[in-house]
């Protein structure tokens, strides 16, 4: 048992049938030694008396609010959230997996620059009773400070019957260089709750294979003469880390007819212009991706032909 | 990356080509390294992420750009020196800080250059013969040292005469590997933002 | 603060019985659990058994059930550990602890003690 936040304690449980479970002691924050009686959320039925109350954990319906009254008076909480532990693995129940870029991938995490600035989604089913803290570091035997915000609901998407519900958290790493050279990964840690069950989800990586740009801006078409050929023109995104010659980008730039089906012509080029051939009813795309530390492509910023 | 890369024009700032063949380099012979080696740690997230040039070059801070001096961050632990020559700064005037920075990118060059060929000596000598250094790299490596154009000098190769861990020398060709590919990212960065300046 | 001194400890043969005493001494008023560990030579230290201060729940650990019992007197801010059926597995340093701090915590786990006496050694022969 340990505790996570004043008052709220975690029991770590094997959870398997016939587990022996934990046994816990209760203890009332008063200096009263007599008429003190315990009860278990909003039961009135007394579990108890005495300055401690000593329980075997071995279920959910062991764990939740324990209180401590002395004469009709509330004198303290202990509320007891369960871990589970099956075949030595820890519950992953809460969160669901989202596959990608492997399996057990729990948190993903986006950085749009080299700021120290970087956002986690996780994805759930659960719409209710749900609370999650989330914690982050560089490094973890000498940590050095990451500040984050509060985790927020950023979507609800239907998936077939269920409802999918996602929730976002952004993160600041206190001092930052963005030429940095990183040799320690960012730790983040998010604690989840449901009713009483708790969990917790790590995810350790580096800021620049994480980084993803925002797509190119200002994505323009000027028709040259006497031709069917357009110069595409774009610019960085204002996210970008600057100096610009120095966090250089690299783009690709592809024509994609109306049919998904219709081959597409695609052109690579350090620069932020192009000159391709524009077909009619095809559209121009333009993505953007760190030139020398290849993580992942922008999203596609796109114009029609016509 | 296998995309077309456009080649640079003869008058352009002569380093940025040969770092941008080093970056292909290193990046290639690391991709090798990971299938090569599968069954070893070396990824990225299995293996330990050591700088052999830590606390003997500032390469980072040398060569920061003019716009990040204003970040604090970025000026935990710079220095300056007086390094004055080298051809890569093609007849410009130049501060005294992009010289240390090109001096500090030569002094990373020379020891990862002298790390490589001592464990090339090894890997040569390991009765599977499982993986080698590409002699490509070693070149560009070499090519850049010279653009540099640094006097310094050379450093013998360690030599050593215990019987290789073979394994263990794999490993540390991984972790190697691995942080030359990060700095030779930065060298690249350096040399696109010297060629723009 | 709180100060534990155990006493008790000695040379008995298999089969024989020992009753070691922890006596606790300063800020005694905030003690919640008081219990009993062992180490045996190049072994780790292993719960023995506990007891809630203000109400008296003891707990011993499988090892000793039947043959060990926990008991306190609060007037004198003592805590007994009666040992009978001695084994020479038993011979070990016995260490007093005490736990001060409220909330939620286990008996068995003595990283949730924040006290400790000095330890007295109990030698069982054959």
């Known amino acids: 048992i340990w505790e996570l936040k004043k008052d709220v304690y975690v029991v770590e449980l094997d959870w398997y049938p016939d587990a022996p479970g934990e046994m816990v002691v209760l203890t009332c924050d008063t200096p009263e030694e007599d008429g003190i009686t315990w009860t278990l959320d909003q039961s009135s039925e007394v579990l108890g008396s005495g300055k401690t109350l000593t329980i075997q954990v071995k279920e959910f319906g062991d764990a939740g609010q324990y209180t401590c009254h002395k004469g009709g008076e509330v004198l303290s909480h202990s509320l007891l959230l369960l871990h589970k532990k099956e075949d030595g693995i820890w519950s992953t129940d809460i969160l669901k997996d989202q596959k990608e870029p492997k399996n057990k991938t729990f948190l993903r995490c986006e950085a749009k620059n080299y700021s120290g600035r970087f956002t986690c989604w996780w994805l759930t089913t659960i719409s209710t009773d749900l609370t999650f803290s989330v914690k982050s570091s560089r490094g973890s035997s000498d940590p050095q400070g990451v500040t984050c915000g509060a985790a927020t609901l950023s979507a609800e998407r239907v998936r077939g019957d269920n409802k999918e519900y996602e929730y976002s958290v952004e993160c600041q790493e206190d001092s930052a260089c963005p030429a940095a050279e990183e040799s320690l990964p960012i730790e983040v840690m998010v604690d989840a709750v449901h009713k009483l069950k708790y969990e917790n989800y790590t995810s350790s990586f580096f800021i620049r294979d994480i980084i993803k740009p925002d797509p190119p801006k200002n994505l323009q078409l000027k028709p040259l003469k006497n031709s069917r050929q357009v110069e595409v023109s774009w610019e960085y995104p204002d996210t970008w880390s600057t100096p610009h010659s120095y966090f250089s980008l690299t783009f690709c730039v592809q024509v994609q007819g109306k049919s998904k089906r219709e081959k597409k012509d695609r052109v690579f080029t350090d620069k932020t212009s192009a000159t391709v051939i524009c077909r009619k009813n095809a559209s121009i795309s333009v993505r953007a991706q760190d030139r020398y530390y290849s993580s992942s492509w922008s999203e596609w910023a796109s114009v029609p032909c016509s | 990356r296998n995309l077309p890369v456009a080649t640079p024009d003869p008058g352009m700032f002569p380093c940025l080509h040969h770092s941008q063949n080093l970056l292909r380099a290193v990046s290639n012979m690391l991709q090798k390294a990971r299938q090569t080696l599968e069954f070893y740690p070396c990824t990225s997230e299995e293996i330990d992420h050591e700088d052999i040039t830590k606390d003997k070059t500032s390469t980072v801070e040398a060569c920061l750009p003019l716009e990040l001096t204003k970040n604090e961050s970025c000026l935990n632990s710079r220095e300056t020196s007086f390094i004055t020559n080298g051809s890569c700064l093609a007849s410009r005037k130049t501060s005294f800080m992009m010289a240390l920075c090109l001096s500090s990118i030569y002094e990373d060059l020379k020891m990862y250059q002298v790390e490589f060929k001592t464990m090339n000596a090894k890997l040569l000598m390991d009765p599977k013969r499982q993986i080698f250094l590409d002699q490509n790299m070693l070149a560009v490596i070499d090519e850049l040292m010279q653009a540099l154009n640094f006097n310094s000098e050379t450093v013998p190769q360690k030599s050593s005469l215990e019987e290789p861990d073979f394994y263990k020398t794999k490993i540390k060709l991984c972790i190697l590997l691995h942080a030359f590919r990060i700095r030779a990212v930065t060298i690249d960065r350096v040399m696109s933002y010297l060629n723009a300046s | 603060e709180v100060q534990l001194v155990e006493s008790g400890g000695g040379l008995v043969q298999a089969g024989g019985s020992l009753r070691l005493s922890c006596a606790a001494s300063?800020?005694?008023?905030?003690?919640?659990?008081m219990g009993w560990f062992r180490q045996a030579p190049g072994k780790e230290r292993e719960f023995v058994g506990a007891?809630?201060?203000?109400?008296?729940?003891?707990a011993v650990a499988d090892s000793v059930k039947g043959r060990f019992a926990i008991s306190r007197d609060s007037a004198k801010n003592t805590v007994y550990l009666q040992m009978n059926s001695l084994k020479v597995e038993d011979t070990a340093v016995y260490y007093c602890?005490?736990?001060?701090?409220?909330?939620?915590?286990?008996?068995?786990?003595?990283?949730?003690?924040?006290?400790w006496g000095q330890g007295t050694q109990v030698t069982v022969s054959s």
């Open positions: 300063g800020r005694t008023y905030s003690t919640v659990a």
């Open positions: 602890a005490s736990r001060t701090n409220i909330g939620a915590f286990n008996l068995f786990r003595e990283n949730h003690y924040n006290y």
């Open positions: 007891i809630t201060w203000s109400v008296g729940n003891t």
